[in-house]
Interface confidence: low
């Protein structure tokens, strides 16, 4: 109670009323004027919100009562006005005055978690003390009223992995967790008011705590040895099989790279990023006959490993991959890419030309059969020996381009061909002859030693660098001696007159036999006739008219 400085004043309290009282006539307190001498002449009146409905006053005494249950959380403060009236005069004894009724709190509200549902993600293997999430409960009771709204948080479910700070609701890790054992935890938090003392109310919430993956597992091969096969005919780049490691981590932490530990020139491993399998690729063609299996060592490592997690990845997992090369039936292989043989023309039927050889590169070594495609001149036997079946004439064909096929006896589908070039070598089987037909003319009055014709020869045999023709007149013509021949020693010769004057009437035409020999071994000689016409020449010694007349005669005209 307190008294105003003024002599006249209210004696009154700031009143408190507990909420939720079951008694409807709860006595709050008493309003009293110090002018009231207790003789019941004063009348007390209550004005303002709640007066008469929620609160009443005993007009005689000034006692105030609450007549209905109050809820502090609905309304915690009532401001009322009081009057004191002299009942005898009906006049106010004091000026109207305000006072306050405060509804005092009782612990009638449990803590509530308003932000649920709670979900948190924390990396697995996080150390003790790592903050996960903070949960906050709200209590509608009065924080200023004792411990009614003072909350303490505790864990109903989640030990020993999590702990909660009792006053802040901060959830922390209290024990390392392995996502590979369990990837999420339901933690149940209880908030209790009254700092947990008897009579406290509580509320609970659930927190779903998910463990995010940390790269704490290395990939490990499922098998110690993988067996793969590859055909020797497989081209480079062929995928020959898959190997698989497993990693208990997920996502990026399970991404792995395979590699070949030995420096393999023949194989490579690439990672299939979808399946995380290792695909073994043929880097270089294999040959069953050279090497029929390979043993390679492969290892696997995670693609992304943070520095602080290296301890989990100290040793890479390794495995062996045995690649069996499958034999592919391959066609025969000739010893040489082509063959070049020589044979003399006019060699007899059955003459040896040369020998080809092919082998089966496969293990079973099939016998080989040979054949010559479309040839009437040569044949081949099963040993690869080529012989002639017809005479050869270099002057008809100096070269033969043959195709010889080798066929495996055990698998006639396996065929190889090789080009064979046969050169027919020259023998001296043709005598030289005039290179053209010569018609020669000489004037009747020709002098001795006059050149009347230069002759040359040809020979169908192969011309060699030092080939040489020798020119002579037949024995008869030499005796006759109207003409002589001089060999120029350059494969040409000149015919000269060997006398002065000829008679057109007596002997209009001379037929001279010219002998031409080559320098082959043995030498061949031919006899060639040279026709020499005697002409009636003009003063200038021209044989032209004689030639023209000859031309007309040859065309069927007569000349006189």
């Amino acid at each position: 109670d307190y008294k105003d400085d003024d002599d006249k004043g209210w004696m009154w309290n700031q009143f408190f009323v507990p909420e939720e009282m079951n008694k409807t006539d709860y006595h709050i307190g008493q309003l009293r004027s110090d002018l009231d001498n207790g003789n019941n002449s004063f009348q007390y009146k209550l004005l303002g919100a709640g007066a008469g409905s929620t609160f009443i006053i005993d007009e005689r005494t000034g006692d105030i009562y609450a007549i209905e249950k109050l809820d502090r959380e609905e309304r915690s403060l009532y401001i009322l006005r009081a009057q004191v009236i002299d009942s005898t005069t009906g006049r106010a004894v004091e000026p109207e005055s305000e006072f306050v009724i405060r509804v005092s709190d009782i612990n009638d509200n449990e803590p509530k978690f308003l932000d649920e549902p709670y979900e948190a993600i924390v990396p697995e293997m996080s150390p003790e003390g790592t903050l996960v999430i903070q949960v906050t409960a709200t209590d509608a009771d009065d924080p200023a009223s004792g411990n009614n709204a003072r909350l303490l948080y505790s864990l109903l479910q989640g030990q020993p992995y999590f702990s909660i700070e009792p006053t802040t609701g901060v959830i922390r890790i209290s024990s390392k967790m392995d996502r590979e054992l369990q990837d999420e935890y339901w933690v149940i938090i209880q908030a209790k008011d009254m700092i947990g003392l008897p009579g406290a109310l509580s509320g609970t919430t659930s927190v779903l705590i998910k463990l995010s993956d940390v790269n704490d597992n290395k990939p490990i091969f499922k098998e110690r040895l993988y067996r793969l096969t590859v055909s020797e005919s497989a081209p480079t780049g062929t995928s020959i099989g898959r190997i698989m490691a497993y990693d208990n981590d997920i996502g990026e932490n399970a991404e792995m790279d395979y590699s070949i530990e030995d420096d393999s020139q023949t194989f490579d491993i690439i990672t299939n990023n979808e399946t995380q399998e290792g695909i073994v690729i043929l880097k270089k063609k294999v040959d069953f006959e050279h090497q029929n299996h390979y043993l390679i060592r492969a290892n696997v490592k995670n693609r992304h490993v943070a520095e602080h997690l290296m301890e989990y990845h100290v040793e890479a997992s390794t495995t062996f991959v045995r690649v069996q090369v499958e034999d592919e039936d391959e066609p025969p292989v000739f010893l040489l890419p082509y063959y070049l043989f020589e044979i003399l023309e006019e060699s007899p039927h059955g003459s040896f030309v040369g020998m080809v050889s092919a082998t089966d590169p496969d293990q079973r070594k099939s016998p080989i059969r040979y054949s010559i495609t479309r040839s009437k001149v040569f044949s081949i036997d099963d040993n690869g020996t080529i012989i002639t079946t017809n005479p050869l004439d270099r002057e008809i064909s100096a070269w033969y381009n043959l195709s010889i096929t080798a066929t495996e006896k055990y698998n006639v589908q396996q065929i190889s061909a090789v080009p064979v070039y046969v050169q027919v070598l020259n023998i001296n089987d043709h005598a030289p002859e005039f290179s053209e037909y010569y018609d020669s003319y000489v004037c009747e009055n020709a002098g001795s030693g006059q050149v009347i014709q230069t002759i040359s020869a040809v020979d169908r045999d192969e011309s060699v660098e030092d080939h040489h023709f020798y020119f002579n007149l037949s024995v008869e013509d030499t005796k006759n001696s109207s003409f002589i021949i001089i060999d120029n020693e350059d494969n040409t010769a000149v015919i000269l007159t060997n006398r002065t004057g000829f008679s057109l009437q007596e002997e209009p035409v001379f037929y001279i036999s010219v002998l031409i020999a080559d320098n082959g071994i043995p030498s061949l000689t031919s006899t060639n006739t040279l026709t020499i016409h005697i002409c009636d020449c003009d003063d200038y010694g021209s044989t032209q008219t004689c030639r023209d007349k000859d031309l007309l005669l040859s065309m069927g005209f007569r000349t006189e």
């Epitope: 992995y161 110690r224 997992s317």
Partner: antibody, heavy 120, light 111 residues
Framework: QVQLVQSGAEVKKPGASVKVSCKAS????????MSWVRQAPGQGLEWMGI????????TYAQKFQGRVTMTGDTSTSTVYMELSSLRSEDTAVYYC?????????????WGQGTLVTVSS | HSVLTQSPSASGTPGQRVTISCSGS????????VNWYQQLPGTAPKLLIY???QRPSGVPDRFSGSKSGTSASLAISGLQSEDEADYYC???????????FGGGTKLTVLG
């Protein structure tokens, strides 16, 4: 200091079963694996299997598959190892040993051992 | 026989340095951490070295571990009489999906 206290010695007849317990204290029981290792008289150590007390996940050595069962009770922080169809060669000292938070991390604490004698 | 191979016995005089070896394969020593245990007569094994070369607190620095490829070794320098015990190597085996122990090496301190 971590403590692993094992049950007392047992004498069993061939064909019977034995159940050995190992009570853990002074650490978070559910965070670590527990292994069982045995040692026959005058012989070396032989690993039998491993259990994670939190989920009850177990891995057994091939030799004991079908004959051994490992269980855990988180309320009492105790693990159990039961071996059935006993034969004389099962006579050994059986140890529990605390592992790490991963299967492949070392055993740091061992129980005092339980002698199991199998004799007719 | 054990997956991990240890020589059955080793000996040395006080003050000497002794090495105990442990040989395995790619799936165990080659891929995982090696641990060494000391077993004094009549007692449970005690962790001596873990993760190849780490010493738990309380283990003297006379003991050291190393690993290379598929074999590991334990070295004891300044040998003392109280070091007389059985020594076991142990490692997780990826292929067997389980722990494997060496057969054990009995260390005798002479004189």
């Amino acid at each position: 200091q971590v403590q692993l206290v094992q049950s007392g010695a047992e004498v069993k007849k061939p064909g019977a079963s034995v159940k050995v317990s190992c009570k853990a204290s002074r650490y978070t029981f559910t965070s670590y694996y527990m292994s069982w290792v045995r040692q026959a008289p005058g012989q070396g150590l032989e690993w039998m299997g491993i259990i994670h007390p939190s989920g009850g996940d177990t891995t057994y050595a091939q030799k004991f598959q079908g004959r051994v069962t490992m269980t855990g009770d988180t309320s009492t922080s105790t693990v159990y190892m039961e071996l059935s169809s006993l034969r004389s060669e099962d006579t050994a000292v059986y140890y529990c040993a605390r592992g790490g938070i991963k299967l492949w991390l070392h055993f740091d604490y061992w129980g005092q051992g339980t002698l199991v004698t199998v004799s007719s | 026989h054990s997956v991990l191979t240890q020589s059955p016995s080793a000996s040395g005089t006080p003050g000497q340095r002794v090495t105990i070896s442990c040989s395995g394969s790619r799936s165990n020593i080659g891929s995982n951490f090696v641990n060494w245990y000391q077993q004094l007569p009549g007692t449970a094994p005690k962790l001596l070295i873990y993760t190849n070369n780490q010493r738990p607190s309380g283990v003297p620095d006379r003991f050291s571990g190393s690993k290379s490829g598929t074999s590991a070794s334990l070295a004891i320098s300044g040998l003392q009489s109280e070091d007389e015990a059985d020594y076991y190597c142990a490692v997780w085996d990826d292929s067997l999906n389980g722990w494997v122990f060496g057969g054990g090496t009995k260390l005798t301190v002479l004189g």
